[in-house]
């Protein structure tokens, strides 16, 4: 799903207040709900009718450093007989997410939000058939 | 997928530098790749064999203010005849994502990262059957 444009109002102080100096603001250390965890079913990426693999990207100057991307294994979907049915489509499910980018020059460290597109998994879809004249 | 714990090292300056004052750091305004957009197939939430609905939550002190959550419509999956097959499972696909929480007291505005669990969509899974003795 989409993350809307900032419009640069969310990070501004109220109009009656002095502006933020130097185009930056204060980010408190620590993460709210840091211990919250995904509780997905075991091995769904292998047992789905639209199975997928995971690829891990790693960047030490990004938080989280590890971003996992899914790739659908098949064009079609796996039927009850375990065969690929090409009349159906394995389709990626994408999500816009935020990460934090770390920028440093010597002892001067600053951070910036970055939008990343993550493919989270795949789903099996019945395509609409069109016969082109 | 999981976001690892910060371990509070990512946001620290190198050891040889003076510590961050007051437990906060500098966040630059603006978002890298802000114009990047999800390009998912049209209406996959309705055309999937494990269809889902969307619910929007809104919070003006969160960025993004709008967070969209998916809920699987069925327990089972939709078969080729358009009927629900309860021998299969519609299973939610979850993703940990970051949002920014805005905290203000008068003209003093600060921000903090928050972890949010988002259900992005659903996939159809063949469960392994166990008969309990």
């Amino acid at each position: 799903r989409k993350i809307p444009k900032v419009g640069h109002t969310f990070f501004q102080k109220p109009e009656s207040c002095p502006p933020v100096p130097g185009g930056s603001m204060k980010l408190d250390i620590g993460i709210i709900n840091e211990n919250q965890r995904v509780s997905m079913s075991r091995n769904i990426e292998s047992r789905s009718t639209s199975p997928w693999n995971y690829t891990v990207t790693w960047d030490p100057n990004r938080y989280p450093s590890e971003v996992v991307q899914a790739q659908c294994r098949n064009l079609g979907c796996i039927n009850a007989q375990g065969k690929e049915d090409i009349s159906m489509n394995s389709v990626p499910i994408q999500q816009e997410t935020l990460v934090v980018r770390r920028k440093h020059q010597g002892c001067s460290v600053s951070f910036q939000l970055e939008k990343v597109l993550v493919t989270v998994g795949c789903t099996c879809v019945t395509p609409v058939i069109h016969h082109v004249q | 997928r999981k976001i690892p714990k910060v371990g509070h090292t990512f946001f620290q300056k190198p050891e040889s530098c003076p510590p961050v004052p007051g437990g906060s750091m500098k966040l630059d305004i603006g978002i890298i790749n802000e114009n990047q957009r999800v390009s998912m197939s049209r209406n996959i939430e309705s055309r999937s064999t494990s269809p889902w609905n969307y619910t929007v939550t809104w919070d003006p002190n969160r960025y993004p203010s709008e967070v969209v959550q998916a809920q699987c419509r069925n327990l089972g999956c939709i078969n080729a005849q358009g009927k629900e097959d309860i021998s299969m499972n519609s299973v939610p696909i979850q993703q940990e994502t970051l949002v920014v929480r805005r905290k203000h007291q008068g003209c003093s505005v600060s921000f903090q990262l928050e972890k949010v669990l988002v259900t992005v969509g659903c996939t159809c899974v063949t469960p392994v059957i166990h008969h309990v003795q």
């Epitope: 997905m40 075991r42 | 699987c72 469960p127």
Partner: nanobody, 116 residues
Framework: QVQLVESGGGFVQAGGSLKLSCSVS????????MGWFRQPPGKGREFVAG????????FYGDSVRGRFTISGDNAKHTLYLQMNSLKPDDTAVYYC?????????YGQGTLVTVSS
């Protein structure tokens, strides 16, 4: 290991009521949904009712909708099926199940007999 123990089955006249219980114990992992299937004599297993754990949504098979009610008691780790306006067609072995999304566990069943 998951344990599922059904109880409450028995003999009842058409139009009567019964309440089935299912006690869940052991490693209950991530629960996607849980509920009841039934198997009438000489027929295949059919879905009766289910409850989704994440939001408490309930789901019913066409033949029981409006007559049967599924509910759960988290504190007691027990699942219930209230069966009203029973018909002879409801005669079956009723199986409790628990489903993690990727694994489904069935109990041993309890027999319900509805006489006309």
């Amino acid at each position: 290991q998951v344990q599922l123990v059904e109880s409450g089955g028995g003999f009842v006249q058409a139009g009567g009521s019964l309440k089935l219980s299912c006690s869940v114990s052991g490693n209950t992992f991530i629960t996607n949904h849980m509920g009841w299937f039934r198997q009438p004599p000489g027929k295949g297993r059919e879905f009766v009712a289910g409850i989704r754990w994440s939001d408490g949504s309930t789901f019913y098979g066409d033949s029981v909708r409006g007559r049967f009610t599924i509910s759960g008691d988290n504190a007691k780790h027990t699942l219930y099926l209230q069966m009203n306006s029973l018909k002879p067609d409801d005669t079956a072995v009723y199986y409790c199940y628990i489903d993690s999304g990727s694994d489904r566990y069935y109990g041993q069943g309890t027999l319900v007999t509805v006489s006309s």
